[in-house]
């Protein structure tokens, strides 16, 4: 089997964590939301050829039927493997309050 | 805010959950799975259009900035939320085997 | 360089109030909060609250309700701190510091040099 | 509010020692922890934060460890410079409070 992190369509094609450079106003929460007043926004972009970075065997299945029925069976999807937790400063109705998300930024990546 | 389940772009398009008839052939399971001889395979297909289904403040965000930066940052995509197990009947070195695995079926969907 | 300097030290007779300024330089006012914190003589650290220096939102300490405002002027790239109704027990030194915020969390990176205020009749 | 208590209150230590704080939480704060050092007559200043990421400019011999509601600061080997109050922060949550402080004196 090829090595489950080895790309082969070239350095940096296939499903990784980038970083995108977003402010308050780009995630739609400038209304509620109060800091930080902008974020490093971690996610999981590229592509999932096959034996890449699988997350189970449902992705394994999932590329096999891909092969054979493209226009029925998508291939699979880079996603977060998990997520590190963030914090925000947000208005609530009372007035302010510091809240931990645990789903925001993606830690790491895989295809599922 | 829309209804989560309600999809914009008519019915059956958006991400939700697929069966798909497959051989052991197909799935490539031919050389090591005695038993079932086909399986429906459940998998999540479909768009993930804004505030469909989104699994987490994750893909509210990937949403925001696919819609800001399209060619920079995918849309959140149609992956499984949980799954169904499912028992193979495997050859094994030392003979024949009862597997459960647990993650081989979508049982829901969401998008991430 | 960053740097936050605070008004001179006080003297002010129970009932009264003080109002304390913190100058911030070397950096967008805008860009980082501010937190106000006091120390009475001997003993700890203790939060007082947070503003944000762009809209001005603020959250106090439960003890300093009623008593404490915080407030900022991005044009001179100030924060103040008023206390009203002084106490004997508000003889401490209050500091201003800035709000580091980022995926790595919130922390206070750089502090003025502290203000004494001294509640005596 | 969540309390923040730090043992032990005070410490004598020799230079090239290893000295260890701890600071416990009275709920689970993530990893939303920072330590600072004080010395008489100055403001605090920032060591540790994210309960393990160092602070620019501060010296490796300053480590953070820990998640939940136990957390560690370690200097590896105790300078003359390093003779002070230090204090745990958590920001997890409003209040933000800070643990009483241990001194670290010359034995």
């Known amino acids: 089997a090829r090595n489950g992190d080895r790309c082969p369509l070239g350095p940096g094609r296939c499903c990784r964590l980038h970083t995108v450079h977003a402010s308050l106003e780009d995630l739609g929460w400038a209304d509620w939301v109060l800091s930080p007043r902008e974020v490093q926004v971690t996610m999981c972009i590229g592509a999932c050829p096959s034996q890449f970075r699988e997350a189970n065997m449902h992705a394994q299945i999932k590329m096999n039927l891909h092969r054979l029925k493209p226009d029925t069976v998508p291939a699979p999807c880079c996603v977060p493997a998990s997520y590190n937790p963030m914090v925000l400063i947000q208005k609530t109705d009372t007035g302010v309050s510091l809240q931990t998300y645990d789903d925001l930024l993606a830690k790491d990546c895989h295809c599922v | 805010a829309r209804n989560g389940d309600r999809c914009p772009l008519g019915p059956g398009r958006c991400c939700r959950l697929h069966t798909v008839h497959a051989s052991l052939e197909d799935l490539g399971w031919a050389d090591w799975v005695l038993s079932p001889r086909e399986v429906q395979v459940t998998m999540c297909i479909g768009a993930c259009p804004s505030q469909f289904r989104e699994a987490n403040m994750h893909a509210q965000i990937k949403m925001n900035l696919h819609r800001l930066k399209p060619d920079t940052v995918p849309a959140p995509c149609c992956v499984p939320a949980s799954y169904n197990p499912m028992v193979l009947i495997q050859k094994t070195d030392t003979g024949v085997s009862l597997q459960t695995y647990d993650d081989l079926l979508a049982k829901d969907c969401h998008c991430v | 360089q960053v740097q936050l300097v605070q008004s001179g030290a006080e003297v002010k007779k129970p009932g009264a109030s003080v109002k304390v300024s913190c100058k911030a330089s070397?950096?967008?006012?805008?860009?980082?909060?501010i937190i106000w914190v006091r120390q009475a003589p001997g003993q700890g650290l203790e939060w007082m609250g947070w503003i944000s220096a762009l809209s001005g939102d603020t959250v106090y300490a439960q003890k300093l309700q009623g008593r404490v405002t915080m407030t900022t002027d991005t044009s001179t790239s100030t924060a103040y701190m008023e206390l009203r109704s002084l106490r004997s027990d508000d003889t401490a030194v209050y500091y201003c510091?800035?709000?580091?915020?980022?995926?790595?969390?919130?922390?206070?990176?750089?502090w003025g040099q502290g203000t004494l205020v001294t509640v005596s009749s | 509010d969540i309390q923040m208590t730090q043992s032990p209150s005070s410490v004598s230590a020799s230079v090239g020692d290893r000295v260890t704080i701890t600071c416990r939480a009275s709920?689970?704060?993530?990893?939303?922890l920072a330590w600072y050092q004080q010395k008489p007559g100055k403001a605090p200043k920032l060591l540790i934060y994210a309960a393990s990421s160092l602070q620019s400019g501060v010296p490796s011999r300053f480590s953070g460890s820990g998640s939940g509601t136990d957390f560690t600061l370690t200097i590896s080997s105790l300078q003359p410079e390093d003779f002070a109050t230090y204090y745990c922060q958590q920001v997890h949550s409003f209040p933000i409070t800070f643990g009483g402080g241990t001194k670290v004196e010359i034995k």
């Open positions: 709920q689970g704060i993530d990893s939303w």
């Open positions: 070397g950096y967008t006012f805008a860009s980082y909060d």
């Open positions: 510091a800035r709000t580091r915020h980022d995926t790595s969390g919130i922390r206070f990176d750089y």
